[in-house]
Amino acid sequence: TPEVWVQVRMEATELSSFTIRCGFLGSGSISLVTVSWGGPNGAGGTTLAVLHPERGIRQWAPARQARWETQSSISLILEGSGASSPCANTTFCCKFASFPEGSWEACGSLPPSSDPGLSAPPTPAPILRAD
C-alpha cells in the first residue's frame, strides 16, 4: 500500500522559518503534489504550494521556496513573519495525487521536543487517504 511521509523542521538560523519535506512511498507516477497547513487539503487546510512534475510549481505566502527533491519527494521552505507565520504546533499536510488512480495524504507537525535544526527521521504519518 502506498504511503506518504511528512517531516517538519524548524531552521536553527531562523527560528520562524520552517522546512517541510514530504515523500511518496509507492509505485506509480505522481501527477500533482499539494502542500497545505491547518489541516488536510480538502478539509479546511490552506494550500501553500502545488507542484506538477512537468508544468511547474505554484506557491503562496508564506511559502518561500518549493522544489522537487526527487521524483517522489518535495521540500518547502516557509518564511515566518507576521500574522501568517507558522507556529510550533502548526499541522502541515502533503497530498500526492496520481490521476486517476488515487491520492494519498499525510500530515505532520514539529516534534514537541525537537531542537532547532534537529529533526525526527521521516516516518509515515497515519492520516492516509486513497480516493
Epitope: S31, T34, V50, R55, G56, R58, A97, D131
Partner: nanobody, 120 residues
Framework: QVQLVESGGGSVQAGGSLRLSCAAS????????MGWFRQAPGKEREGVAH???????RYVESVKGRFTISQDHAKNTLYLQMNSLKPEDSATYYC??????????????WGQGTQVTVSS
C-alpha cells in the same frame, strides 16, 4: 474531503447528445479550475474542457463547437453538454477540480468517472 459525483453517462448513437453532470461537495483552497478529463482504453488521458475561476471556458481542439462546459454555482454543479457525438468520444469521463498551470487544469480531486459509449 472533496467529493465529486458524476452522472449522465451512457450509450448513444453517433450524432446524438449526452449531458454530463458533476456535483461537488466542497472545494480545496486556492483551486482555480474545474473541468472534465477523459480516458479511453489504450489512449492518452486528455483534458476535454475546463472553466477557470474567471469563468472562461477552454476546450481541447477536437471538441470545439460540439461540447459546452458550464457551471451552476448555486448548485455547486458542473455540466458538459456533448452534441454531435462521435465514436472517438467514447471514454470514461472524469470531473476534476484542480490548479491552473498555464492553459492546463491539473487535477487535484476527481470523481469516480462516468462511461460514455458512442456507437456508429
Amino acid at each position: 474531503q472533496v467529493q465529486l459525483v458524476e452522472s449522465g453517462g451512457g450509450s448513444v448513437q453517433a450524432g446524438g447528445s449526452l449531458r454530463l453532470s458533476c456535483a461537488a461537495s466542497r472545494y480545496t483552497s486556492r483551486t482555480d479550475c474545474m473541468g472534465w478529463f477523459r480516458q479511453a482504453p489504450g489512449k492518452e488521458r486528455e483534458g476535454v474542457a475546463h472553466i477557470d475561476s474567471d469563468g472562461i471556458p477552454r476546450y481541447v481542439e477536437s471538441v470545439k463547437g460540439r461540447f459546452t462546459i458550464s457551471q451552476d454555482h448555486a448548485k455547486n454543479t458542473l455540466y458538459l453538454q456533448m452534441n454531435s457525438l462521435k465514436p472517438e468520444d467514447s471514454a470514461t469521463y472524469y470531473c476534476v477540480v484542480g490548479f491552473k498551470f498555464g492553459d492546463y487544469c491539473a487535477p487535484n480531486d476527481w470523481g469516480q468517472g462516468t462511461q460514455v459509449t458512442v456507437s456508429s
